[in-house]
Amino acid sequence: SGTTNTVAAYNLTWKSTNFKTILEWEPKPVNQVYTVQISTKSGDWKSKCFYTTDTECDLTDEIVKDVKQTYLARVFSYPAGNVESTGSAGEPLYENSPEFTPYLETNLGQPTIQSFEQVGTKVNVTVEDERTLVRRNNTFLSLRDVFGKDLIYTLYYWKSSSSGKKTAKTNTNEFLIDVDKGENYCFSVQAVIPSRTVNRKSTDSPVECMGQEKGEFREI
């Protein structure tokens, strides 16, 4: 139902990386505008992105209040210039989103190798602890703060002269690996949440190689 000149939104999709969360939908509006509402399963609806001609709405501020909650959003369609107009049932046309649980579903952003340091035949590789938009006591939490030991990193490392990738894993942000003396190595890391069944992995970090700026070499 609804007025003859509005169509319901469709293909409502959550796009979320490191808890930065945007709801997207179709169609591009023709003579209509949209308003979004979001709620937890047990909470009240909160309106966002009032009467917008966009087909996306940033809901990060709402979901970061409790990333372990499950959220539902809905997109209302109104005739442009006549937002008080309602459908034949006395309500504007709307469509529900799929449920979304940020902690379980947000994509892991591409990690970054912060540094690596070689001391003899050991290399310490450090992964940058990326800041999220999740707040606690007025400070932004890092990815590690939010996920704790649920988040691991896999390090892929290989001799510059070979193709086989060895792996190491850590539930901190640091790796300590053994390397062959006199060999240059390259590194890439991947963030993983092993307990998940979907959206388990990030994309790989940019590759960093020894002999380039980021690392430090010390002969002991």
């Epitope: 691991i152 896999t154 990738k165 991947q190 790989d204």
Partner: antibody, heavy 120, light 107 residues
């Protein structure tokens, strides 16, 4: 239900080639690491190699390096083990296994295995 | 490569017995050790991960522990279905390596 099914085993002459398949269902291989492990008749388990289908990264045991190649087709949700220059000592049951990529790296699901016999 | 030395290679035990299998790593592997059970003609099954965590669906008579580079699998009260071969495995570094296996037979 998570399942891994190997196929492609059989009898092959020394120096010959064989391609094994590992078809996954109940999960997407892109999200995991897939290993191949073999077991010679009456012997223990020997790790062969792995692939991370999300980036194509691989690593092989020294005993098969340069002869075996692991690949994956994420659209088919299948991993492969291409075995070339086969030797008698490659005779074994070949298993594929899923690595959940936890810190300890355990293999939580295994296929039923496929027998490869290298003999003239 | 890290060697995993497993002992004993075989043992005979009776139903109800307490059985202990050990694995020694040639270097530090933290807790990155798993234990598997394999029955003839079947694929291995995961029992213990991270040295001491019981995998889902595995009976609580199985347990794992770590002391430095020594790892132990204990079956508190052996059941008829437990007669099988057991393997330890480290995945602290690539390549992952297995112990030689311990065959648990009926006395």
């Amino acid at each position: 239900e998570v399942q891994l099914v190997e196929s492609g085993g059989g009898l092959v002459q020394p120096g010959g080639s064989l391609r094994l398949s590992c078809a996954a269902s109940g999960f997407t291989i892109f999200d995991y690491i897939i290993h191949w492990v073999r077991q010679a008749p009456g012997k223990g388990l020997e790790w062969v190699g792995y692939i991370d289908p999300s980036n194509g990264y691989t690593y092989y045991a020294d005993s098969v390096k340069g002869r075996f190649t692991i690949s994956a087709d994420t659209s088919k949700n299948t991993a492969y083990l291409q075995m070339n220059s086969l030797r008698a000592e490659d005779t074994a049951v070949y298993y594929c296994a899923r690595d959940i990529q936890s810190v300890s790296g355990e293999f939580d699901y295994w296929g039923q295995g496929t027998l490869v016999t290298v003999s003239s | 490569d890290i060697q995993m030395t497993q002992s004993p290679s075989s043992l005979s035990a009776s139903v109800g017995d307490r059985v202990t299998i050990t694995c020694r790593a040639s270097q530090d592997v933290n807790t990155a050790v798993a234990w598997y059970q394999q029955k003839p003609g079947k694929a291995p099954k995961l029992l213990i991960y991270s040295a001491s965590f019981l995998y889902s669906g595995v009976p609580s008579r199985f347990s794992g522990s770590r002391s430095g580079t020594d790892f132990t699998l204990t079956i508190s009260s052996l059941q008829p279905e437990d007669f099988a071969t057991y393997y330890c495995q480290q995945h602290y570094t690539t390549p992952p390596t297995f112990g030689q296996g311990t065959k648990v037979e009926i006395k």
